[in-house]
């Protein structure tokens, strides 16, 4: 029984509001209750918006003043419950809900996948490590249940020991050359321009697990660089295609202080990682333009810019190189923070749903932390297939190899 109607004086609603037009105040007199009057008035004053049964796919309708609300069943959404949620579950929408990689399929639901060293959980979206040291995780933080590093670099902070475990220090003839990024146990990514002036290729050393350059704490691992692979399109002394892939003579041993950064799939990097605003850059580079280099590894959080915005916000310099589709800008134009000489080749690492990925390589800029200029980074997503193909290839004789690109 409808208690709401039973309480009305017989005939009053019929007489006052059905046979004649009544006002809100007259209805208020009948109902004696503001809430009940409001419920009646919504339908009475502008008709029942639910009368046409607008809610589809089994949704229930609630009339409102000049409108209605649909309450949808779990699998549907949209104003009229017209959209099947699985139809919206596509990779361009929030990475399809996937923790790592997402693939669209025609006619069927998208599927999630995980990077090597991870496996997909039963929920179909989450990834769990299957190895002790999966890429993109920071063991010392995972073990103490912390999340992001505190957070070279001009205007940055010291990267606490072990919180940048993929950082590589490159030495030539015993002197600091550049940074690099470990992407698996035998491969390091760096910048091509680091090798422009190398004469003694046999004296290239990569050091992993390094933190303080003035101290040997036992966590470091040094390896000879067996091969330096540079794209055939890179021209020494220029800025485009500034990437190098280094093969180590022996694999490193993964530890709490030596862990690779994940090399992402191209589509994931382009449609998801590229839209993560802040990323970390790190290195032992100069602390000021023309200043001393850092002894402790430094890290800096930098915002990424669309190239158009970067060009609009940068001061025009006559001899400034173009920012091509193989680069991107990141950082600050106020002169406060930037990567610098000595950081070159180091990682621009992006965090997404619990895992870190390589998205850029410290490449070039107009000075360091120069007012009106941003840092420019190699856009790693353009080289994923090139890198993967080379990592599957057999070693070739000679240290320097120029490999066709694309």
């Amino acid at each position: 029984a409808n208690a709401f109607l039973e309480e009305l004086r017989p005939g009053s609603l019929e007489r006052e509001c059905k046979e004649e037009q009544c006002s809100f105040e007259e209805a208020r007199e009948i109902f004696k209750d503001a809430e009940r009057t409001k419920l009646f008035w919504i339908s009475y004053s502008d008709g029942d918006q639910c009368a046409s049964s607008p809610c589809q796919n089994g949704g229930s309708c609630k009339d409102q003043l000049q409108s209605y609300i649909c309450f949808c069943l779990p699998a549907f959404e949209g104003r009229n419950c017209e959209t099947h949620k699985d139809d919206q579950l596509i990779c361009v929408n929030e990475n399809g809900g996937c923790e790592q990689y997402c693939s669209d399929h025609t006619g069927t639901k998208r599927s999630c996948r995980c990077h090597e060293g991870y496996s997909l959980l039963a929920d179909g979206v989450s990834c769990t490590p299957t190895v002790e040291y999966p890429c993109g995780k920071i063991p010392i933080l995972e073990k103490r249940n912390a999340s992001k590093p505190q957070g070279r670099i001009v205007g940055g902070k010291v990267c606490p020991k072990g919180e940048c475990p993929w950082q590589v220090l490159l030495l030539v003839n015993g002197a600091q050359l550049c940074g690099g990024t470990l992407i698996n146990t035998i491969w390091v990514v760096s910048a091509a321009h680091c090798f422009d002036k190398i004469k003694n290729w046999r004296n290239l050393i990569a050091v992993l697990g390094e933190h303080d350059l003035s101290e040997h704490d036992g966590d470091e691992q040094s390896r000879r660089v067996a091969q330096v692979i540079i794209p055939s399109t890179y021209v020494p002394g220029t800025t485009n295609h500034d990437i190098a892939l280094l093969r180590l003579h022996q694999p490193v041993v993964l530890t709490d202080h030596v862990v690779p950064l994940c090399l992402p799939e191209r589509t994931f990097s382009e449609r998801t990682l590229a839209f993560v605003r802040f990323s970390l850059v790190s290195g032992w580079g100069q602390l000021l333009d023309r200043g001393a280099t850092a002894l402790e590894l430094m890290v800096l959080n930098v915002p990424r810019l669309m190239t158009q915005d970067c060009l609009q916000q940068s001061r025009k310099v006559g001899d400034s190189p173009n920012i091509t589709e193989y680069m991107f800008c990141a950082g600050y134009s106020d002169g406060s923070k930037d990567s610098c000489k000595g950081d070159s080749g180091g990682p621009h690492a992006t965090h997404y749903r619990g895992t870190w990925y390589l998205t850029g390589i410290v490449s070039w800029g107009q000075g360091c932390a120069t007012v009106g200029h941003f840092g420019v980074y190699t856009r790693v997503s353009q080289y994923i297939e090139w890198l993967q193909k080379l990592m599957r290839s057999e070693p070739r004789p000679g240290v320097l190899l120029r490999a066709p690109f694309p």
Partner: antibody
Framework: QVQLKESGPGLVAPSQSLSITCTVS????????VSWIRQPPGKGLEWLGV???????YNNSALKSRLSISKDNSKSQVFLKMNSLQADDTAMYFC????????????WGQGTSVTVSS | DIVMTQSHKIMSTLVGDRVSITCKAS??????VAWYQQKPGQYPKLLIY???TRHTGVPDRFTGSGSGTDFTLTISNVQSEDLADYFC?????????FGGGTKLEIK
């Protein structure tokens, strides 16, 4: 230029302790590590331990707890203290500066001779 | 501890000759190996580090090579002033360890 100079007692009685000072110039102890190495007469080199710029020390476990290394950055001095000396501790004791990145000892002192005898 | 073995205690050579002094590690230490020269009555001097990088001021007749566990110091065109003891050292792991040394004699 870089210089290191060791100064020690020369003669130490058995079971007594040894103290040697390494005074450095041409570099800062806050930036570079200093190792201690010894060489018994007519024999090879034995690494004893190191103190790094930040103050961390690493000792050769073969010497157990007999060895301690410390420093005074403001005086540019590094100290080696060794307890319970025996005849086989007789040696030339060297201090040596470490370079960056390489962990190698790129500059050495002339050494100070220590004889353990009663 | 890592043991560094220099199998030749003494090596004899003529002025102008080429000599190779070898060093074997008990485990992989590549490339964290250094070579030192100690002339009679003097302190050791660094010659080579990272297995093959010459220290500042070291003549280019001194060359370091090798990998893994086997390392070599080669002196080409030996000079009389090269008469000395030569020690290899690993700095891959603590404690740092030295080889027993090779005495180079000039005939």
């Amino acid at each position: 230029q870089v210089q290191l100079k060791e100064s020690g007692p020369g003669l130490v009685a058995p079971s007594q302790s040894l103290s040697i000072t390494c005074t450095v110039s041409g570099f800062s102890l806050t930036d570079y590590g200093v190792s201690w190495i010894r060489q018994p007469p007519g024999k090879g080199l034995e690494w004893l331990g190191v103190i790094w710029g930040g103050g961390n020390t690493y000792n050769n476990s073969a010497l157990k707890s007999r060895l301690s290394i410390s420093k005074d950055n403001s005086k540019s001095q590094v100290f080696l203290k060794m307890n319970s000396l025996q005849a086989d501790d007789t040696a030339m004791y060297f201090c040596a500066k470490h370079g960056y990145y390489g962990y190698v000892m790129d500059y050495w002192g002339q050494g100070t001779s220590v004889t353990v005898s009663s | 501890d890592i043991v560094m073995t220099q199998s030749h205690k003494i090596m004899s050579t003529l002025v102008g000759d080429r000599v190779s002094i070898t060093c074997k590690a008990s485990q992989d230490v590549d490339p964290a190996v250094a070579w030192y020269q100690q002339k009679p009555g003097q302190y050791p001097k660094l010659l080579i580090y990272w297995a093959s990088t010459r220290h500042t001021g070291v003549p280019d007749r001194f060359t370091g090579s090798g990998s893994g566990t086997d390392f070599t110091l080669t002196i080409s065109n030996v000079q009389s002033e090269d008469l000395a003891d030569y020690f290899c050292q690993q700095y891959s792991k603590y404690p740092y360890t030295f080889g027993g040394g090779t005495k180079l004699e000039i005939k």
